[in-house]
């Protein structure tokens, strides 16, 4: 059959691998597109075929599996590079077929260079550690399947450029790196280098992740509204601009959605007819506590507007709070000539 179910170029799976290192790439067909796995497909007589298009070329070509030392090989549904080279960058296609069935998908593979401090264009996973929270660990990611469980690899951990040796509160423990008590000074990029033997030589796997020390749940509190507050009264004359900031502090909470909103006479600003604009700004502390400010603005306030109730609301996983702004109409000062006349007993 000439027809083939073509899933196109799967750009969602932009795979990045380091130059001069082993890489194992699973055919995405079985992971994301088909309802059966490779073993089922293989036992049903289907064959998995790989080919590629080099970077900046249009020509699809077969992958050369006859390179010295089997540099590129296929094992079940995995394409292996031992190791990668920079010019392996391109779009790779895996096609599953027999005489009556065909399905294929392409995906981009980018071979990335790293500098001597492990900096690279690679997108880094971020691991958040709670500040002063007791022992916490990070684990060297994405090394499964590279060597059999019977092989014990050697793991070296680095912070930035530096080998982690005799650090006060950071201890390498094989695949794990333990932080005895995480501090702001522990923020940074951590790299594990996994060295393992295979086919008469050694290989290195380099994995870098970013550690960000964040606020501890032990210290987390419900949202705190700093403004509006009882000390500030927004006193305006009709025709003036009314500006009321709502400033809310949120403790860092993992996966919490922080929300701030205004109500005017109990309704969302979108649901009322007055001309209100709301501008939001967000800032973060070093431990990712968040301060959100929403400024409610009415360009030309009316006396009716000055009688309304303006309430700032805030919500996080820790709770919900609200605070009303004190808004009032400015009482015009008595005119000087009238007062003077009254003072002299004029009628």
């Amino acid at each position: 059959s000439e027809r083939c179910d073509d899933w196109g170029l799967d750009t969602m799976r932009q795979i990045q691998v380091f130059e001069d290192e082993p890489a194992r790439i699973k055919c995405p067909l079985f992971e994301h597109f088909l309802k059966f796995n490779y073993s089922t497909a293989h036992s049903a007589g289907l064959t998995l075929i790989w080919y590629w298009t080099r970077q900046d070329r249009d020509l699809e070509e077969p992958i050369n599996f006859r390179l010295p030392e089997n540099r590129i090989s296929k094992e079940k549904d995995v394409l292996w590079f031992r190791p990668t080279l920079l010019n392996d960058t391109g779009n790779y296609t895996c096609m599953l077929r027999n005489t009556t069935y065909c399905s294929k998908v392409a995906f981009p593979l980018e071979v990335v260079q790293k500098d001597s401090c492990f900096n690279s264009p690679m997108k880094l996973p971020v691991h958040k550690l709670y500040i002063e929270y007791g022992i916490q660990r990070i684990t060297c990611p994405n090394v499964d399947g590279y060597f059999p469980s019977s092989v014990k690899p050697t793991i070296t951990w680095y912070m930035g450029c530096y080998k982690i040796q005799n650090f006060n509160n950071v201890i390498p423990e094989g695949m794990n790196l333990s932080f005895l008590i995480a501090l702001i000074s522990n923020n940074g990029n951590y790299t594990c280098v996994v060295t393992y033997p295979e086919n008469g030589r050694t290989f290195h796997l380099t994995r870098t992740l970013t550690v960000k020390v964040v606020g501890s749940p032990k210290n987390a509190v419900p949202p705190v509204i700093h403004s509006p507050n009882d000390h500030v009264v927004y006193e305006k004359e009709p025709g003036e601009e009314l500006l009321i900031p709502c400033t809310v502090y949120f403790s860092f909470l993992m996966d919490s959605r922080n929300e701030v909103w205004w109500t005017i006479d109990g309704k969302k600003p979108d649901d009322i007819t007055i001309d209100v604009t709301i501008n939001e700004s967000i800032s973060h502390s070093r431990t990712e506590d968040e301060t959100r400010t929403q400024i409610l603005s009415i360009k030309k306030v009316t006396s009716e507007d000055l009688k309304r109730s303006y309430v700032c609301h805030a919500r996080s996983a820790k709770g919900e709070v609200a605070k009303a702004a004190k808004v009032k109409q400015k009482v015009p000062a008595p005119r000087y000539t009238v007062e003077l006349a009254c003072g002299f007993g004029a009628t």
Epitope: D20, E21, D115, C117, Y158, T195, P197, G200, H204
Partner: antibody
């Protein structure tokens, strides 16, 4: 720290075992390497024993040397059949990617 | 395979001057390169690892650079105490096809 021992004067063909003793280094977490230096010559890598237990030897060292982990604190280097060309200071060092720290070395003299 | 060629074999330097030592690998070693200093009767001392990272307690007058196959050790503001032999070492690959992971060494003589 790292310290080598066992170096002495031997006659050609007499097997000799050198021992590298470590303290403050967990041999289950670190690879160990042996390097030698003939008088007035450069550094010559002999081989490395990995935490996996796998040993790799330099092309010229295969069959002439045996590296083994003998305890939780010791790694041995056996010179199976020394020749006069094996006269050198033998160093043990922690690591396989880079070497640090090094022991002070132990001198082996092969002479008839 | 992965032979390390170090140049020059010997270099003279004046106190306060600069010395440059080069190391070339026969194939890319992906920045897995270290530099060592050795004085007579002593074991080698690590100066630099991962091509450019200064080992603990080493003077910042020592600078490592390079990538791929070509690497350089620069000693600036040379002092008489820098008189020693310097070696490069590749850590990218260990295999039984390798003759030596070290370069041949460079003797630095300080005048």
């Amino acid at each position: 720290s790292v310290e080598e021992s066992g170096g002495r004067l031997v006659t050609p063909g007499t097997p000799l075992t050198l021992t590298c003793t470590v303290s403050g280094i967990d041999l289950s977490s670190y690879d160990m390497s042996w390097v030698r230096q003939a008088p007035g010559e450069g550094l010559e890598w002999i081989g490395t024993i990995y935490v996996s237990g796998r040993v790799y030897y330099a092309t010229w060292a295969k069959g002439r040397f045996t590296i083994s982990k003998t305890s939780s604190t010791t790694v041995d280097l056996e010179i199976t059949s020394p020749t006069t060309e094996d006269t050198a200071t033998y160093f043990c060092a922690r690591g396989s990617i880079d070497y640090d720290p090094w022991g002070p070395g132990t001198l082996v003299t092969v002479s008839s | 395979a992965y032979d390390m060629t170090q140049t020059p074999a010997s270099v003279e330097a004046a106190v306060g001057g600069t010395v440059t030592i080069k190391c070339q690998a026969s194939q890319s070693i992906s920045s897995w390169l270290s530099w060592y200093q050795q004085k007579p009767g002593q074991p080698p001392k690590q100066l630099i690892y991962r091509a450019s990272t200064l080992a603990s307690g080493v003077s910042s007058r020592f600078k490592g650079s390079g990538s791929g196959t070509d690497y350089t050790l620069t000693i600036s503001g040379v002092q008489s105490d820098d008189a020693a032999t310097y070696y490069c070492q590749q850590g990218y690959i260990t295999s039984s096809n390798i003759k030596n992971v070290f370069g041949g060494g460079t003797e630095v003589v300080v005048k």
